[in-house]
Amino acid sequence: ESGYAQNGDLEDAELDDYSFSCYSQLEVNGSQHSLTCAFEDPDVNTTNLEFEICGALVEVKCLNFRKLQEIYFIETKKFLLIGKSNICVKVGEKSLTCKKIDLTTIVKPEAPFDLSVIYREGANDFVVTFNTSHLQKKYVKVLMHDVAYRQEKDENKWTHVNLSSTKLTLLQRKLQPAAMYEIKVRSIPDHYFKGFWSEWSPSYYFRTPEINNSSGEMD
Protein backbone atom coordinates (compact mmCIF):
# COMPACT_ATOMS: atom_id res chain seq x y z
CA GLU A 1 0.00 0.00 0.00
CA SER A 2 1.29 3.46 -0.84
CA GLY A 3 2.58 5.59 1.99
CA TYR A 4 1.00 8.59 0.26
CA ALA A 5 -2.64 7.63 0.60
CA GLN A 6 -3.56 8.60 4.12
CA ASN A 7 -2.84 12.31 4.55
CA GLY A 8 -4.29 14.01 1.52
CA ASP A 9 -2.74 17.16 0.15
CA LEU A 10 0.71 17.10 1.74
CA GLU A 11 1.63 13.61 0.62
CA ASP A 12 0.17 14.22 -2.82
CA ALA A 13 2.25 17.36 -3.06
CA GLU A 14 5.42 15.35 -2.49
CA LEU A 15 4.71 13.34 -5.64
CA ASP A 16 4.70 16.41 -7.85
CA ASP A 17 7.66 18.03 -9.59
CA TYR A 18 8.13 21.44 -8.05
CA SER A 19 11.26 22.46 -9.95
CA PHE A 20 11.26 26.18 -10.59
CA SER A 21 13.34 28.95 -12.11
CA CYS A 22 13.83 32.56 -11.05
CA TYR A 23 15.29 35.77 -12.37
CA SER A 24 16.19 39.02 -10.67
CA GLN A 25 15.93 42.58 -11.97
CA LEU A 26 18.09 45.09 -10.13
CA GLU A 27 17.05 48.72 -9.65
CA VAL A 28 13.98 47.98 -11.71
CA ASN A 29 11.94 50.63 -9.90
CA GLY A 30 14.26 53.31 -8.55
CA SER A 31 16.39 51.58 -5.94
CA GLN A 32 13.96 48.65 -5.68
CA HIS A 33 14.93 45.21 -6.97
CA SER A 34 12.60 42.46 -8.08
CA LEU A 35 12.70 38.68 -8.04
CA THR A 36 10.36 36.57 -10.14
CA CYS A 37 9.97 32.80 -9.87
CA ALA A 38 7.77 30.31 -11.70
CA PHE A 39 7.36 26.56 -11.86
CA GLU A 40 8.94 24.79 -14.83
CA ASP A 41 5.80 22.69 -15.24
CA PRO A 42 2.89 24.95 -16.18
CA ASP A 43 0.43 22.27 -15.03
CA VAL A 44 1.53 22.31 -11.39
CA ASN A 45 -1.42 22.94 -9.09
CA THR A 46 -0.22 26.06 -7.28
CA THR A 47 -3.08 26.19 -4.79
CA ASN A 48 -1.65 26.60 -1.27
CA LEU A 49 1.91 26.82 -2.63
CA GLU A 50 4.07 29.73 -1.53
CA PHE A 51 7.59 30.91 -2.29
CA GLU A 52 9.93 32.24 0.37
CA ILE A 53 13.46 33.66 0.19
CA CYS A 54 15.76 33.54 3.22
CA GLY A 55 19.31 34.77 3.71
CA ALA A 56 21.42 37.53 2.18
CA LEU A 57 18.71 40.04 3.02
CA VAL A 58 18.95 43.40 4.78
CA GLU A 59 17.24 43.77 8.18
CA VAL A 60 15.02 40.69 7.74
CA LYS A 61 15.65 36.96 7.77
CA CYS A 62 13.06 35.93 5.16
CA LEU A 63 10.61 37.45 2.69
CA ASN A 64 7.46 35.97 1.17
CA PHE A 65 6.58 36.32 -2.51
CA ARG A 66 3.34 37.72 -3.84
CA LYS A 67 1.46 35.45 -6.22
CA LEU A 68 0.41 36.98 -9.55
CA GLN A 69 -1.49 34.34 -11.52
CA GLU A 70 1.17 31.70 -12.32
CA ILE A 71 4.23 33.66 -11.22
CA TYR A 72 5.60 34.57 -7.81
CA PHE A 73 7.07 38.01 -7.33
CA ILE A 74 8.92 40.21 -4.83
CA GLU A 75 9.81 43.89 -5.19
CA THR A 76 12.06 45.15 -2.40
CA LYS A 77 15.15 47.13 -1.42
CA LYS A 78 16.15 44.38 1.00
CA PHE A 79 18.34 42.19 -1.24
CA LEU A 80 21.91 42.31 0.03
CA LEU A 81 23.23 41.20 -3.40
CA ILE A 82 26.16 39.53 -1.69
CA GLY A 83 26.20 35.78 -1.09
CA LYS A 84 23.59 33.10 -1.56
CA SER A 85 19.93 33.14 -0.64
CA ASN A 86 17.74 30.09 -0.14
CA ILE A 87 14.55 30.14 -2.21
CA CYS A 88 11.95 27.56 -1.21
CA VAL A 89 8.59 26.35 -2.39
CA LYS A 90 6.46 25.83 0.71
CA VAL A 91 3.11 24.44 1.64
CA GLY A 92 2.31 25.74 5.08
CA GLU A 93 5.54 25.48 7.10
CA LYS A 94 6.91 22.57 5.05
CA SER A 95 9.51 23.19 2.33
CA LEU A 96 8.92 21.06 -0.76
CA THR A 97 12.02 22.08 -2.69
CA CYS A 98 14.71 24.75 -2.28
CA LYS A 99 17.50 26.32 -4.32
CA LYS A 100 20.57 28.24 -3.17
CA ILE A 101 20.95 31.21 -5.50
CA ASP A 102 23.13 34.31 -5.67
CA LEU A 103 20.72 36.91 -7.03
CA THR A 104 23.50 38.62 -8.99
CA THR A 105 23.89 35.50 -11.16
CA ILE A 106 20.26 35.35 -12.37
CA VAL A 107 19.87 38.91 -13.61
CA LYS A 108 17.50 39.55 -16.48
CA PRO A 109 17.96 43.09 -17.85
CA GLU A 110 15.07 45.26 -18.87
CA ALA A 111 14.32 45.18 -22.58
CA PRO A 112 15.94 47.86 -24.75
CA PHE A 113 13.61 50.50 -26.17
CA ASP A 114 13.42 53.36 -28.70
CA LEU A 115 14.92 51.22 -31.45
CA SER A 116 15.18 53.12 -34.71
CA VAL A 117 16.94 52.90 -38.07
CA ILE A 118 18.04 55.91 -40.10
CA TYR A 119 19.21 55.62 -43.70
CA ARG A 120 22.25 57.73 -44.65
CA GLU A 121 22.16 58.28 -48.37
CA GLY A 122 25.67 59.67 -48.71
CA ALA A 123 27.24 56.90 -46.67
CA ASN A 124 25.10 54.14 -48.17
CA ASP A 125 24.36 52.66 -44.79
CA PHE A 126 21.75 52.37 -42.07
CA VAL A 127 22.43 53.60 -38.54
CA VAL A 128 20.67 51.51 -35.92
CA THR A 129 20.26 53.10 -32.48
CA PHE A 130 18.40 52.05 -29.35
CA ASN A 131 18.23 52.95 -25.70
CA THR A 132 18.54 51.02 -22.46
CA SER A 133 17.54 51.98 -18.94
CA HIS A 134 20.73 50.32 -17.69
CA LEU A 135 22.94 53.25 -18.64
CA GLN A 136 21.57 55.06 -15.57
CA LYS A 137 21.86 52.15 -13.14
CA LYS A 138 24.36 51.70 -10.32
CA TYR A 139 24.79 47.95 -10.71
CA VAL A 140 23.96 46.31 -14.04
CA LYS A 141 25.49 48.90 -16.36
CA VAL A 142 27.55 46.73 -18.70
CA LEU A 143 25.48 44.74 -21.16
CA MET A 144 25.95 42.75 -24.32
CA HIS A 145 23.26 43.48 -26.89
CA ASP A 146 21.98 41.15 -29.59
CA VAL A 147 20.57 42.95 -32.61
CA ALA A 148 18.58 40.63 -34.85
CA TYR A 149 17.24 41.55 -38.27
CA ARG A 150 15.57 39.74 -41.13
CA GLN A 151 13.90 40.37 -44.42
CA GLU A 152 10.22 40.32 -43.59
CA LYS A 153 9.49 37.51 -46.04
CA ASP A 154 12.17 35.23 -44.48
CA GLU A 155 10.27 33.89 -41.50
CA ASN A 156 13.15 32.35 -39.54
CA LYS A 157 16.26 33.68 -41.27
CA TRP A 158 17.49 36.12 -38.63
CA THR A 159 20.95 37.70 -38.79
CA HIS A 160 22.40 38.44 -35.34
CA VAL A 161 25.01 41.04 -34.40
CA ASN A 162 26.44 41.24 -30.87
CA LEU A 163 27.64 44.61 -29.63
CA SER A 164 28.34 46.42 -26.37
CA SER A 165 27.32 49.89 -27.56
CA THR A 166 23.83 51.09 -28.42
CA LYS A 167 24.67 52.01 -32.01
CA LEU A 168 25.22 49.77 -35.03
CA THR A 169 25.89 50.53 -38.68
CA LEU A 170 24.49 48.19 -41.34
CA LEU A 171 26.03 48.52 -44.78
CA GLN A 172 23.50 48.98 -47.55
CA ARG A 173 25.28 46.49 -49.82
CA LYS A 174 24.75 43.74 -47.23
CA LEU A 175 20.98 44.14 -47.49
CA GLN A 176 18.57 43.30 -50.29
CA PRO A 177 17.31 46.34 -52.26
CA ALA A 178 13.65 47.38 -52.15
CA ALA A 179 12.95 45.05 -49.27
CA MET A 180 11.13 45.41 -45.99
CA TYR A 181 13.21 44.48 -42.94
CA GLU A 182 12.30 43.79 -39.33
CA ILE A 183 14.83 44.51 -36.60
CA LYS A 184 14.79 43.99 -32.82
CA VAL A 185 17.27 43.96 -29.93
CA ARG A 186 17.73 42.30 -26.53
CA SER A 187 20.38 42.50 -23.79
CA ILE A 188 22.24 40.24 -21.37
CA PRO A 189 24.58 41.09 -18.45
CA ASP A 190 28.18 41.13 -19.65
CA HIS A 191 30.50 41.97 -16.73
CA TYR A 192 30.16 41.63 -12.96
CA PHE A 193 26.68 40.09 -13.22
CA LYS A 194 25.41 36.91 -14.81
CA GLY A 195 21.98 35.92 -15.99
CA PHE A 196 19.59 35.77 -18.89
CA TRP A 197 18.58 37.56 -22.05
CA SER A 198 16.07 40.35 -21.63
CA GLU A 199 12.81 40.29 -23.52
CA TRP A 200 13.09 41.55 -27.08
CA SER A 201 12.45 45.20 -27.74
CA PRO A 202 9.45 46.01 -29.89
CA SER A 203 10.35 45.41 -33.53
CA TYR A 204 11.15 48.28 -35.89
CA TYR A 205 10.43 47.99 -39.63
CA PHE A 206 12.34 49.73 -42.39
CA ARG A 207 12.54 49.53 -46.16
CA THR A 208 15.75 49.52 -48.19
CA PRO A 209 15.93 51.75 -51.28
CA GLU A 210 15.65 50.37 -54.80
CA ILE A 211 18.68 49.92 -57.02
CA ASN A 212 19.46 52.87 -59.29
CA ASN A 213 19.82 51.10 -62.66
CA SER A 214 22.36 53.50 -64.16
CA SER A 215 24.96 53.06 -61.45
CA GLY A 216 24.04 49.78 -59.86
CA GLU A 217 23.64 51.72 -56.61
CA MET A 218 20.54 51.67 -54.49
CA ASP A 219 18.40 54.79 -54.39
Epitope: L81, I82, G83, K84, D102, T104, T105, Y139, H191
Partner: nanobody
Framework: EVQLVESGGGLVQAGGSLRLSCESS????????MGWFRQAPGKGLEWLAA????????HYSDSVKGRFTISRDNAKNTVYLQMNSLRSEDTGRYYC???????????WGQGTQVTVSS
Protein backbone atom coordinates in the same frame (compact mmCIF):
# COMPACT_ATOMS: atom_id res chain seq x y z
CA GLU B 1 44.35 22.03 4.06
CA VAL B 2 44.84 25.70 4.98
CA GLN B 3 42.18 27.48 2.95
CA LEU B 4 42.23 31.19 3.89
CA VAL B 5 45.44 32.97 4.85
CA GLU B 6 45.46 36.62 5.94
CA SER B 7 48.55 38.82 5.80
CA GLY B 8 49.55 42.49 5.94
CA GLY B 9 48.87 43.20 9.61
CA GLY B 10 51.34 44.99 11.86
CA LEU B 11 51.97 48.03 14.00
CA VAL B 12 51.01 51.40 12.55
CA GLN B 13 50.62 54.91 13.91
CA ALA B 14 47.22 56.57 14.18
CA GLY B 15 46.32 58.24 10.88
CA GLY B 16 48.38 55.71 8.95
CA SER B 17 47.36 53.05 6.44
CA LEU B 18 47.62 49.29 6.03
CA ARG B 19 46.53 46.89 3.32
CA LEU B 20 45.43 43.44 4.40
CA SER B 21 45.36 40.50 2.01
CA CYS B 22 43.54 37.19 2.24
CA GLU B 23 44.51 34.42 -0.15
CA SER B 24 42.06 31.58 -0.70
CA SER B 25 42.75 28.03 -1.84
CA UNK B 26 39.03 27.27 -2.14
CA UNK B 27 38.13 26.18 -5.67
CA UNK B 28 34.92 28.23 -5.77
CA UNK B 29 36.61 31.52 -4.80
CA UNK B 30 35.62 33.37 -7.97
CA UNK B 31 31.92 32.69 -7.35
CA UNK B 32 31.99 33.23 -3.57
CA UNK B 33 31.25 36.34 -1.54
CA MET B 34 34.08 37.44 0.77
CA GLY B 35 34.06 39.39 4.01
CA TRP B 36 36.35 41.00 6.57
CA PHE B 37 35.78 40.94 10.33
CA ARG B 38 37.76 42.02 13.36
CA GLN B 39 37.90 41.22 17.03
CA ALA B 40 39.13 43.98 19.30
CA PRO B 41 40.71 42.98 22.64
CA GLY B 42 38.00 41.80 25.01
CA LYS B 43 35.24 42.38 22.42
CA GLY B 44 33.11 40.20 20.15
CA LEU B 45 33.55 39.64 16.42
CA GLU B 46 32.60 42.69 14.34
CA TRP B 47 31.70 42.57 10.66
CA LEU B 48 33.51 45.26 8.65
CA ALA B 49 33.01 44.78 4.92
CA ALA B 50 31.76 42.33 2.31
CA UNK B 51 32.14 41.98 -1.43
CA UNK B 52 30.20 39.99 -4.02
CA UNK B 53 31.75 37.37 -6.29
CA UNK B 54 32.55 39.82 -9.09
CA UNK B 55 33.50 42.84 -6.99
CA UNK B 56 30.55 44.86 -8.29
CA UNK B 57 28.69 44.94 -4.98
CA UNK B 58 30.24 45.98 -1.68
CA HIS B 59 28.86 46.78 1.76
CA TYR B 60 30.55 48.38 4.78
CA SER B 61 29.76 48.77 8.45
CA ASP B 62 29.22 52.33 9.62
CA SER B 63 32.39 52.14 11.73
CA VAL B 64 34.68 51.82 8.67
CA LYS B 65 32.66 53.41 5.86
CA GLY B 66 34.73 56.00 4.02
CA ARG B 67 38.01 54.79 5.56
CA PHE B 68 38.24 51.14 4.52
CA THR B 69 37.89 49.69 1.02
CA ILE B 70 37.33 46.04 0.18
CA SER B 71 38.39 44.72 -3.22
CA ARG B 72 39.24 41.42 -4.85
CA ASP B 73 41.36 39.90 -7.60
CA ASN B 74 39.73 36.70 -8.84
CA ALA B 75 42.78 35.84 -10.94
CA LYS B 76 44.86 35.74 -7.74
CA ASN B 77 42.17 34.23 -5.48
CA THR B 78 42.76 37.15 -3.14
CA VAL B 79 40.60 39.69 -1.32
CA TYR B 80 42.02 42.92 0.10
CA LEU B 81 41.13 45.42 2.80
CA GLN B 82 42.69 48.84 2.32
CA MET B 83 42.58 50.63 5.69
CA ASN B 84 43.19 54.39 5.79
CA SER B 85 42.99 56.98 8.59
CA LEU B 86 43.53 54.26 11.16
CA ARG B 87 42.50 54.94 14.77
CA SER B 88 43.46 53.31 18.04
CA GLU B 89 40.01 51.69 18.17
CA ASP B 90 40.84 49.82 14.94
CA THR B 91 43.30 47.68 16.92
CA GLY B 92 42.39 43.99 16.84
CA ARG B 93 42.72 40.72 15.02
CA TYR B 94 41.39 40.87 11.47
CA TYR B 95 39.79 37.82 9.86
CA CYS B 96 38.59 37.12 6.35
CA UNK B 97 35.68 34.83 5.59
CA UNK B 98 34.43 33.20 2.41
CA UNK B 99 31.12 31.98 0.97
CA UNK B 100 28.20 33.81 2.56
CA UNK B 101 25.55 31.12 2.29
CA UNK B 102 22.11 31.84 3.75
CA UNK B 103 23.54 34.21 6.37
CA UNK B 104 26.42 31.93 7.42
CA UNK B 105 30.07 32.39 6.42
CA UNK B 106 31.37 28.93 5.52
CA UNK B 107 35.15 29.40 5.72
CA TRP B 108 37.36 31.45 8.04
CA GLY B 109 41.02 32.38 8.17
CA GLN B 110 43.24 32.40 11.25
CA GLY B 111 43.50 36.18 11.30
CA THR B 112 46.24 38.82 11.24
CA GLN B 113 46.95 41.26 14.08
CA VAL B 114 46.63 45.02 13.55
CA THR B 115 47.83 47.42 16.26
CA VAL B 116 47.27 51.15 15.93
CA SER B 117 49.35 53.23 18.33
CA SER B 118 48.48 56.77 19.29
Amino acid sequence: EVQLVESGGGLVQAGGSLRLSCESSISTFSSDAMGWFRQAPGKGLEWLAAIGWSGAVTHYSDSVKGRFTISRDNAKNTVYLQMNSLRSEDTGRYYCAEDYDTDVWQYWGQGTQVTVSS
